[in-house]
């Protein structure tokens, strides 16, 4: 009898075990379900953002290949220029080449006329080296042509087809940069 | 509605380093931007660093070289690695989020002390 119920009670361990490994079965199932889940749902939030909007650059941007351009209509210092463009998913504009800096020139003389346009270049207060934004160096043809005399930071900005440099705190206009939407064919 | 809960602020010593890190309850993919900012006694808030929806990235000129910006976004999580820390950084360190139509979202703060 007492072999009877130690059988017993194995069969009933050995149910329980079986029990709890479908049990963790299910949870490390339905962990998964629920990451796909969220991946799912920001891919259809990314997908129905670009359908709601399927121009490459939004309203009141320009675009030049693969890169959408805002031209502000404000004033303000560079610091807050470059919190302005982080607000709007982009940042101050990082020229990378000649043809895009013909492309700029060009676009604001039809705009604007000759205005002073804050971009994403400043001084490194050690060094004196220029360097964009996020810590690249500009190519030398797309240096500021004049050496600020301020003693404060001195921060680059566009007027009529020339690169220049300014204090930091002056009020300037500014030009956002950010990846035009690729067309999904 | 954007939750941001930020982490991994304490006191180090100058020269050292620190990982901040800002968790946020929405796909940070989907999101403008998710900026650093901090703000010591007396003194304005500053921007730190900052990374757009498509991957671009702004520092300050102070910690430029020093700071470094990036994200998961599989986690949903924002990171800034502070190096070479001076005691000129100390400060509350503040994840913000802007989303779709420019609205920011903060964090609570995390506190960064670094002690010369």
């Known amino acids: 009898k007492l072999l009877q119920v130690s059988t017993i009670a194995m069969q009933q361990q050995e149910k329980l075990i079986q029990q709890e490994r479908a049990l963790l079965n299910f949870t490390e199932w339905k962990r998964s379900c629920a990451l796909q889940m969220k991946y799912c749902q920001a891919f259809m939030q990314n997908s129905l953002s670009s359908a709601h909007n399927s121009s490459p650059c939004p309203n009141n941007w320009i675009q030049n290949r693969e890169s959408c351009y805002y031209v502000s209509e404000i004033w303000s210092i560079w610091h807050t220029s470059q919190e302005n463009c982080l607000k709007e998913g982009s940042t101050l504009l990082q020229i990378e080449s000649k043809e895009e800096m013909d492309f700029i020139t060009g676009s604001l003389r039809k705009i604007k006329g000759s205005y002073d346009y804050w971009v994403g270049l400043s001084q490194d207060g050690h060094s004196g080296r220029w360097l964009w934004q996020d810590g690249s160096s500009p190519s030398p043809g797309l240096l500021p042509a004049e050496r600020s005399q301020s003693a404060n930071q001195v921060c680059g900005y566009v007027k009529s087809n020339s690169l220049l440099s300014s204090n930091c705190s002056t009020w300037k206009y500014f030009i956002c940069e950010k990846y035009a939407l690729r067309s999904s064919v | 509605q954007v939750q941001l809960q930020e982490s991994g602020g304490g006191l180090v010593q100058a020269g050292g380093s620190l990982r901040l890190s800002c968790v946020a309850s929405?796909?940070?993919?989907?999101?403008?931007?998710m900026v650093w900012y901090r703000q010591s006694p007396g003194k304005q808030r500053e921007l730190v660093a900052g990374i757009t929806g498509s991957g671009q990235i702004t520092y300050a000129n102070s910690v430029r070289g020093r700071f470094t910006v990036s994200r998961d976004i599989a986690k949903s999580t924002a990171y800034l690695q502070m190096n070479t820390l001076k005691p000129e950084d100390t400060a509350v360190y503040y994840c913000?989020?802007?989303?779709?139509?420019?609205?920011?979202?903060w964090g609570q703060g995390t506190q960064v002390t670094v002690s010369s």
């Open positions: 913000a989020a802007y989303d779709r139509s420019a609205t920011a979202y």
């Open positions: 929405v796909n940070i993919g989907s999101l403008n931007s």
